[in-house]
């Protein structure tokens, strides 16, 4: 497969990955099929520093990321571990707070308007963030 | 000029098969996700499936699932849309369309192929 070597138009380049950044809302999941389609993922925050990078381009909106917890434990869209990896929740945040009538819990992981995270039903349109990674080889599948 | 040129329509028996291919040029088709979309006669335009530029990831709508599969080929700047056991309420106009960039909508599409399933 070819490399990446510079970022599609309309992404910023940061640390050797690319980012876009919404301006309207889906659901969580669409927000991660619509990454997906442009074979990138939702962002995946693996350092204070790419938070802060993050932060800086969102501004005070909710917004979601690559986190979720749909299946059980919380779980990183591109695999990163999560256990050991970077965490910037609110206070007494993830609480999968089932008091908002929507049904169910809270299974999403957004940044607040300070940036810190909180967890939050996945049908609510907030905007997202979609990341790939430069030097990362495009995977061509076999033709059918 | 962008120009895409849809190919591969025609009749066929319900259960039947075909393959759809969307010829593009004009613009760098490696780096665009890519659109299949049709209108049955008499009704508006339905969103068939959906490809990433790589081809990893795909998508489809519900009335399509398990029966069509969209394809692609960056090195002869191609799409298809492979067609399987077709029914009657397949018949429609098929067309492939490219996305503006930002993503807002199509600003390219084909001048379409007609797909007429009936026994």
């Known amino acids: 497969g070819s490399e990446r070597t510079c970022c599609p138009v309309n992404w910023v380049e940061h640390e050797r990955s690319c980012y876009w950044f919404s301006r309207s809302g889906k659901a969580w999941a669409d927000a991660d099929n619509y990454c997906r389609l442009e074979d990138a993922h939702l962002v995946v925050v693996t350092s204070w520093e790419e938070q802060k990078f993050v932060q800086h381009h969102i501004g005070p909106v909710n917004t979601w990321m690559g986190l979720h917890d749909q299946n059980g434990p919380w779980k990183w869209v591109d695999g990163t571990d999560y256990e050991t990896g970077f965490k910037n929740w609110r206070p007494e945040q993830p609480d999968d707070w089932y008091g908002h009538g929507l049904g169910g819990g809270e299974d999403c992981a957004h940044f607040t308007d300070d940036g810190r995270w909180n967890d939050d039903v996945c049908q609510r349109p907030y905007r997202w963030v979609c990341e790939t990674e430069l030097d990362k080889a495009s995977q061509e599948p076999p033709l059918l | 000029e962008v120009q895409l040129l849809e190919s591969g329509g025609g009749l066929v028996q319900p259960g039947g098969s075909l393959r759809l291919s969307c010829a593009a040029s004009?613009?760098?088709?490696?780096?665009?996700?890519m659109h299949w979309a049709r209108q049955a006669p008499g009704k508006g335009l339905e969103w068939v499936s959906s490809?990433?530029?790589?081809?990893?990831?795909?998508y489809y709508a519900d009335s399509v699932k398990g029966r069509f599969i969209i394809s692609r080929d960056n090195s002869k700047n191609t799409l298809y849309l492979q067609m399987n056991s077709l029914r009657a309420e397949d018949t429609a106009v098929y067309y492939c369309?490219?996305?503006?960039?930002?993503?807002?909508?199509?600003?390219?599409w084909g001048q379409g192929t007609l797909v007429t399933v009936s026994s």
């Open positions: 369309a490219k996305p503006s960039n930002p993503r807002y909508y199509f600003d390219y």
């Open positions: 004009g613009f760098t088709f490696s780096r665009y996700p």
């Open positions: 490809i990433s530029p790589s081809g990893v990831s795909t």
